[in-house]
Interface confidence: medium
């Protein structure tokens, strides 16, 4: 599923991401935009043999199990395919674990490069939330 901007903002808010670990909803929507272009089925392969999955491009070396990433830790204890569902529950729950890990949203390269320090509230402007 490819979410609309406000549709995703509403879903993320419903799942408790607004101000989760101090990160406003705009940060999460911005991250999703530049990680996956709001596409729940996005997959991207990395040079280390791992793959990023879903709307927040969660990595198989650390966070989920895709059955083929050497040394996978699967810290979210889920199959990576669960992160590709049109229901974003699994992605949100895993993202909460990631953002609580110590580096905050710096874990997402796209957030670091495209969202951090910008007017992230623009990503939820005009949305009925």
């Amino acid at each position: 599923k490819v979410f609309g901007r406000c549709e995703l903002a509403a879903a993320m808010k419903r799942h408790g991401l607004d101000n989760y670990r101090g990160y406003s909803l705009g940060n999460w929507v911005c991250a999703a935009k530049f990680e996956s272009n709001f596409n729940t089925q996005a997959t991207n392969r990395n040079t280390d043999g791992s793959t990023d999955y879903g709307i927040l491009q969660i990595n198989s070396r650390w966070w989920c199990n895709d059955g083929r990433t050497p040394g996978s830790r699967n810290l979210c204890n889920i199959p990576c395919s669960a992160l590709l569902s049109s229901d974003i529950t699994a992605s949100v729950n895993c993202a909460k674990k990631i953002v609580s890990d110590g580096n905050g949203m710096n874990a997402w390269v796209a957030w670091r490069n495209r969202c951090k320090g910008t007017d992230v509230q623009a990503w939820i402007r005009g949305c009925r939330l």
């Epitope: 392969r45 050497p70 199959p79 590709l84």
Partner: antibody, heavy 116, light 107 residues
């Protein structure tokens, strides 16, 4: 136990298309990548590409882009590979395998012969 | 693409001999190297994963070693059922690639 059952041998004319199937049993089909591999005598094994059935995400070896197309039907736990514009170079045995990085589980292979 | 070069192309041995098969990668692939055996008209069978881990049900006479670019499959005291083709495969990057194979034949 994990099993991959491929469709039977095919004899096709040059220029035609063929669709090979790979039915998976014994594991959660949507969770693992299905890989496709080509084997021709004297050419060893070649990786064609892969599909994640749960999402339909696909990756192709550049060499096979435009030649192979992957699909999957999660209701029947079956992956498909269509090969188009067949030539004699496509005559080979085609395997599906479960993508664990390594390939512990293979189909029995589908022999494709392209001949006029 | 990562090239895998296997040597020798053919190895003629007598049952009871011990042999080593080589697989060399064109660039470092850490331990992401796997070995397969294939008999005529059969699918490949996984022997060794991640350079040195024996796959389920594989006899202890098969062992693997190496890291980076140089890898070895060793068969201690070859048995008649071991004859066939041996392939290596890398999963360090895409596209996945295979070696050209080593044929193990009876002398």
């Amino acid at each position: 136990q994990v099993q991959l059952q491929e469709s039977g041998a095919e004899v096709m004319k040059p220029g035609a298309s063929v669709k090979i199937s790979c039915k998976a049993t014994g594991y959660t089909f949507t969770t693992y990548w299905i890989e496709w591999v080509k084997q021709r005598p004297g050419h060893g094994l070649e990786w064609i590409g892969e599909i994640l059935p749960g999402s339909g995400s696909t990756y192709y070896n550049e060499k096979f882009k435009g030649k192979a197309t992957f699909t999957a039907d999660t209701s029947s736990n079956t992956a498909y590979m269509q090969l188009s514009s067949l030539t004699s170079e496509d005559s080979a045995v085609y395997y599906c395998a479960r993508g664990d990085g390594f390939y512990c589980y293979w189909g029995q292979g589908t022999t494709l012969t392209v001949s006029s | 693409d990562i090239e895998l070069t296997q040597s020798p192309a053919t190895l003629s041995v007598t049952p009871g001999d011990s042999v080593s098969l080589s697989c060399r990668a064109s660039q470092s692939i850490s331990n992401n190297l796997h070995w397969y055996q294939q008999k005529p008209h059969e699918s490949p069978r996984l022997l060794i994963k991640y350079a040195s881990q024996r796959a389920s049900g594989i006899p202890s006479r098969f062992s693997g070693s190496g890291s980076g670019t140089d890898f070895t499959l060793s068969i201690n005291s070859v048995e008649t059922e071991d004859f066939g083709m041996y392939f290596c495969q890398q999963s360090n990057s895409w596209p996945r690639t295979f070696g050209g194979g080593t044929k193990l034949e009876i002398k």
